[in-house]
């Protein structure tokens, strides 16, 4: 049978041939009658055999990391017979390991992020090196990790490559660290090979800084003409944190006048001072307010860093603006009786310059021919007023500063013309009546009513009477209905068209004013020929039209 031991060849042997071992048949008596042959991949190129002795040699430098075993076939032939002495057999040549590979970090580059202020022992990242040498061959591939750079902030577990924090770090002082890790094989013993890797460790921000005003005092100005909502300036606090942790909210801490507000511009992280109420230089020309700033997001466990909010004082100066004259009232209402003579006093308006220089004021009335105003604001009439023409006047009074005629204010002034009893009552319309020749006594001829152009104080009351002459003629009589109307009745039986075709009746109408005014109004009554039913037969054309209910102009 075949005789051989396990074959090993060390890798990386530089000699031209290295004796691996010997193959032989136990039938071989050493008389050189046997011929040994090597077959298979590597036979003749990597390995050769001494045909006489069966000694195998490696003639090529081998790399275990490339290939760690070769399976070859062996034959032995009797030279004299040419026959196989032994059955063809397979054998294995193993390539034994030497420590010729340094550890390599295959997952480079390494980068890790860890929150600042993380406690000691916090895991940052695990780095792993690979060693191509045989892990089952001694310590060639047994690695130990150590820290070459990164103390005192980091440490590495020697056997696992786990990097941990060994000292708290403040991102605001340094936000990233380069740590260099070395991996040594042979568990660090002499002759070990090593490899290194760099780990970039970035500190992520935690909200361990509150925003702080760099300025303890801000000076701002606001024009007294600024409308509410005007931005009058910005204030700025600085937070050493970044991102969401640096977002802040500004607010008013003290503002007794409640004149200002602060809003936050979340894009620029500035505080914008806003005018909440209009200011008046003449009333108050400076203000002092206190503002505070806090972070927008604060975790409960980080509240210790945010106990007292940073504050700043803001002095706000009000800028004077040349303001137009200011009337004492927003509008005026005056009263004056009608029929008062030209130049009569109506009332006084008053405007002043609100500014400190107190410019004299000049007054004018816009488009009025009835009133006048002097430099004292006294309004007088330029004509006698008739309430029955105009009961109200709407005036526009303008006040102009003497020293700056561009500063103008206008207000409405309403003048009410008061009534006096200067109009007597009169017929509400023109009356023309008729009476039949055969009319009986007490027959109603006409109902009349009156109007008075004067304004009634409470309610007009008119009194109707016949004139003394008409009362004496006694053809007609009048009855006052006590409701501002009266009826005319016949006071006799029968009228004669030929003798007296027309009657003119004078009617007195008095009002209840003080003094009472009376007017005389004429009522025309035509006598007509009527039939038995009272329909007119013979009457002049005009009278006939009237009787039919038509009014002619």
């Amino acid at each position: 049978g075949w005789v051989w031991n396990q074959f090993f060849v060390p890798e990386e042997m530089n000699t031209t041939s290295h004796h691996v071992g010997r193959l032989r048949s136990d039938l071989d008596n050493g008389n050189n009658s046997f011929q040994y042959k090597l077959l298979g991949a590597g036979a003749g190129s990597t390995f050769i055999i001494d045909e006489r002795t069966g000694d195998i040699y490696a003639i090529e430098k081998l790399d275990r990391e490339e290939r760690s075993l070769y399976i070859l076939r062996a034959q032995v032939i009797d030279i004299t017979t040419g026959r196989a002495v032994e059955p063809e057999s397979e054998f294995v040549i193993k390539v034994s390991d030497i420590n010729d590979n340094e550890p390599k970090f295959l997952d480079e580059p390494y980068e890790a992020i860890v929150p600042e202020m993380s406690p000691e022992g916090t895991l940052v990242i695990q780095v792993t090196a690979s060693d191509a040498d045989d892990p089952s061959s001694g310590n060639n591939a047994r690695l130990l990790y150590s820290l070459l750079q990164g103390q005192p902030y980091f440490s590495v577990e020697p056997t696992t490559g786990v990097i941990r924090i060994s000292s708290k770090m403040d991102r605001e002082l340094q936000d990233e660290y380069w740590v260099i890790i070395q991996a040594k094989d042979m568990i660090g013993q002499p002759g070990a090979l090593s490899g290194t890797t760099s780990v970039l460790i970035k500190l992520s921000d935690v909200n361990d800084n509150k925003p702080i005003f760099k300025e303890s005092l801000y000076r701002l100005t606001v024009s007294e003409s600024a409308p509410t909502g005007t931005s009058i300036g910005t204030i700025m606090a600085y937070d050493n944190d970044i991102g969401e942790n640096a977002e802040m909210d500004y607010s008013i801490e003290e503002d007794d006048s409640q004149t200002f507000d602060i809003i936050t511009n979340h894009e620029t992280q500035e505080g914008i001072v806003i005018l909440k109420k209009k200011v008046n230089f003449e009333h108050q020309n400076h203000y002092g307010i206190r503002a505070k700033v806090k972070n927008h997001h604060v975790d409960e466990q980080l509240m210790k860093y945010h106990t007292e909010a940073s504050t700043t004082f803001i002095k706000i100066q009000v800028e004077d603006v040349d303001e137009p004259p200011l009337f004492l009232l927003p509008y005026y209402i005056f009263e004056i009786f009608e029929e008062t003579p030209q130049g009569s006093f109506v009332g006084v308006v008053s405007a002043t310059d609100p500014d400190n220089r107190k410019s004299p004021i000049r007054y004018s009335i816009t488009r009025s021919k009835v009133f006048n105003i002097d430099d004292n604001g006294t309004i007088t009439t330029t004509n006698s007023l008739d309430r029955e023409i105009s009961a109200w006047y709407n005036l526009s009074i303008t006040a102009t500063e003497k020293y700056n005629i561009e500063q103008i204010s206008s207000i409405p002034v309403y003048v009410q013309v008061l009534n006096i009893n200067d109009h007597a009552p009169e017929f509400s319309q023109y009356y023309e009546s008729y009476v039949c020749e055969n009319a009986g006594s007490g027959q109603v001829i006409q109902t009349i009513s009156a109007v008075d152009r004067d304004e009634s104080i409470e309610e007009h009351h008119f009194y109707f009477n016949l004139s003394v002459e008409d009362t004496n003629s006694s053809s007609f009589t009048i009855i006052d209905n006590q409701d501002n109307t009266a009826v005319i009745l016949t006071n006799r039986t029968g009228f004669n068209l030929q003798e007296e075709p027309i009657f003119y009746i004078s009617i007195l109408i008095a009002d209840n004013g003080i003094p009472s005014l009376t007017s005389t109004n004429t009522l025309t009554i035509h006598v007509c020929d009527c039939d038995d039913s009272g329909s007119t037969q013979t009457c002049q054309y005009q009278e006939l039209m009237l009787s039919m209910g038509f009014k002619t102009e």
Epitope: L39, G40, A43, E65, E66, R67, S68, I71, E90, A132
Partner: antibody, heavy 120, light 108 residues
Framework: QVQLQESGPGLVKPSQTLSLTCTVS??????????WSWIRQHPGKGLEWIGY???????YYNPSLKSRVSISVDTSKNQFSLKLSSVTAADTAVYYC????????????WGQGTLVTVSS | EIVLTQSPGTLSLSPGERATLSCRAS???????LAWYQQKPGQAPRLLIY???SRATGIPDRFSGSGSGTDFTLTISRLEPEDFAVYYC?????????FGQGTRLEIK
Amino acid sequence: QVQLQESGPGLVKPSQTLSLTCTVSGGSISSGGYYWSWIRQHPGKGLEWIGYIFYSGKTYYNPSLKSRVSISVDTSKNQFSLKLSSVTAADTAVYYCARVYSNYGWFDPWGQGTLVTVSS
Amino acid sequence: EIVLTQSPGTLSLSPGERATLSCRASQSVSSSYLAWYQQKPGQAPRLLIYGASSRATGIPDRFSGSGSGTDFTLTISRLEPEDFAVYYCQQYGSSPITFGQGTRLEIK
């Protein structure tokens, strides 16, 4: 798991050089114990081994193609490449890259293959 | 160079049947150095068997390999529809690496 992907021109002119690259993902080309190989398959025919390379740069070629073949490796890019010079129509084939287990010689895994046509 | 001869060139069988594919080497090959592959149209070959008899990861147990020296066999105990493909043997025992010409397994 390791995956391989061939890339390169699908058409090459006769007498020119065919160049293909195989990109390895899911593992390192620098891992010991493996060769990185090229195999081709003529249309409708069997498989032909072209050659392989170890990450150290050591190469092994099929003697029938040795004079025209060059295989190289770029460990930084995790890639290996094939160059076949002086091509003729007979080099028209689907070219595969594959990983070879160096001790026992089987091919696993394979790339999906890329057809290279040699034509003017 | 070792020449691998596969037989038959084409094998026509029905699903459920047993398939036996042969690979003969022109010279002795270590069983450790023989592998079988399956290739479907438009796809790359897939490793089925290595070391003459060991199934690759994820290969169903209906596939088995045997043989030594110069004669090797791939057996599919019960054909499934997805098994119809071309099968190649490959050797690593001698340089250059060579493949058989393939056996086409088709549905009868």
